[in-house]
């Protein structure tokens, strides 16, 4: 692959971990002990896109799976999905815009803004065991802040 990637896990600001929920969905819930092994390991790739001091364009793949988080319109609403890709061609420098997120770091917390849909963010619910989704509000009930934990290759 012609891009750099790092392996990581993500937890929301309430310390909920992200796990697979069926083949094409992620959910967020609190995990402890051995259950932590269930959490999804992402391969975060640094890709081409508009960049500023606090915004870094990334693609979020699932490690060793040909699945990437992507943002598409469904019923006229920006929606987060897991999309299957050809592993021979991904990751790549010029990822399609639906796969690109602006990683924004503020006070040691991360936000992931959709490049395709500005001001829409990867979000989790306050409630346990609910799907990870694309939300259009910050600072409300839904959680848009995450921390990243590095995982050795």
């Amino acid at each position: 692959a012609p891009v750099r990637s790092l392996n990581c896990t993500l937890r929301d600001s309430q310390q909920k971990s992200l796990v697979m929920s069926g083949p094409y969905e992620l959910k967020a819930l609190h995990l402890q002990g051995q259950d932590m092994e269930q959490q999804v390991v992402f391969s975060m790739s640094f890709v081409q896109g508009e960049e500023s001091n606090d915004k870094i364009p990334v693609a979020l793949g699932l490690k060793e799976k040909n699945l990437y988080l992507s943002c598409v319109l469904k019923d006229d609403k920006p929606t987060l999905q897991l999309e299957s890709v050809d592993p021979k061609n991904y990751p790549k420098k010029k990822m399609e815009k639906r796969f690109v997120f602006n990683k924004i770091e503020i006070n040691n917390k991360l936000e992931f803004e959709s490049a395709q849909f500005p001001n829409w963010y990867i979000s989790t619910s306050q409630a346990e065991n609910m799907p990870v989704f694309l939300g259009g509000t910050k600072g409300g009930q839904d959680i848009t802040d995450f921390t990243m934990q590095f995982v050795s290759s």
């Epitope: 891009v3 790092l6 640094f46 081409q48 990243m148 590095f150 050795s152």
Partner: antibody, heavy 120, light 107 residues
């Protein structure tokens, strides 16, 4: 403002091991998202990448030097180090350490370089 | 293995535009960057991610990358631009690769 400073012996005998240290100030060598690299430049020649370390444990090396190179990190001293074994005169060069932000695909901070001569 | 090729030297008159090329197989699919190195000094990053300038680098220095060629362009070239310039790319098999360097002479 992150600064890098190389240190180590300026003269190494053939067949011995070259050892250099890079001290990081104004930032942390253990902070994620950076490669910490070594690059060398023989007299009158171009730049040659030696290798790098990231997340304090993962390393990448130049395939042509891989069998002789070890790069490590000492987080307690905020340093990373280079060891190059079985040196010859061809290893005589200015050795630089550099920081490479993962998303830059380029080295944005360099040390001032240290000259190492291999001679008996 | 992946290699980058640069012309050994480029000459330009003051005030003119200097272009330095860097070629490699499918280089446009990779990220390229450029360094300026003056005699006795450490290299300085002037372009990263093909086109982006670090803070403090003047706007007259620009970069592009497509096909098999990355290009560093210096417009309104000044005597202070006289230096060696190195391209560099990242590849997952060979990791960091430098071009051989180009000596820019301002006539």
């Amino acid at each position: 403002q992150v600064q890098l400073q190389e240190s180590g012996p300026g003269l190494v005998k053939p067949s011995e091991t070259l050892s250099l240290t890079c001290t990081v100030s104004g930032g942390s060598v253990s902070s994620g998202g950076y490669y910490w690299s070594w690059v060398r430049q023989p007299p009158g020649k171009g730049l040659e990448w030696i290798g790098c370390i990231y997340f304090s444990e993962s390393t990448n090396y130049n395939p042509s030097l891989k069998s002789r190179v070890t790069i490590s990190v000492d987080t307690s001293k905020n340093q990373f180090s280079l060891k190059l074994s079985s040196v010859t005169a061809a290893d005589t060069a200015v050795y630089y350490c550099a920081r490479d932000p993962m998303h830059y695909y380029g080295m944005d901070v360099w040390g001032q370089g240290t000259t190492v001569t291999v001679s008996s | 293995s992946f290699e980058l090729t640069q012309p050994p030297s480029v000459s330009v008159s003051p005030g003119q535009t200097a272009s330095i090329t860097c070629s490699g197989d499918k280089l446009g699919d990779k990220f390229a960057c450029w360094y300026q190195q003056k005699p006795g000094q450490s290299p300085v990053l002037v372009i990263y991610q093909d086109t982006k300038r670090p803070s403090g680098i003047p706007e007259r220095i620009s970069g592009s990358n497509s096909g098999n060629t990355a290009t560093l362009t210096i417009s309104g070239t000044q005597a202070m631009d006289e230096a060696d310039y190195y391209c560099q790319a990242w590849d997952s098999s060979t990791y960091v690769v430098f071009g051989g360097g180009t000596k820019l002479t301002v006539l």
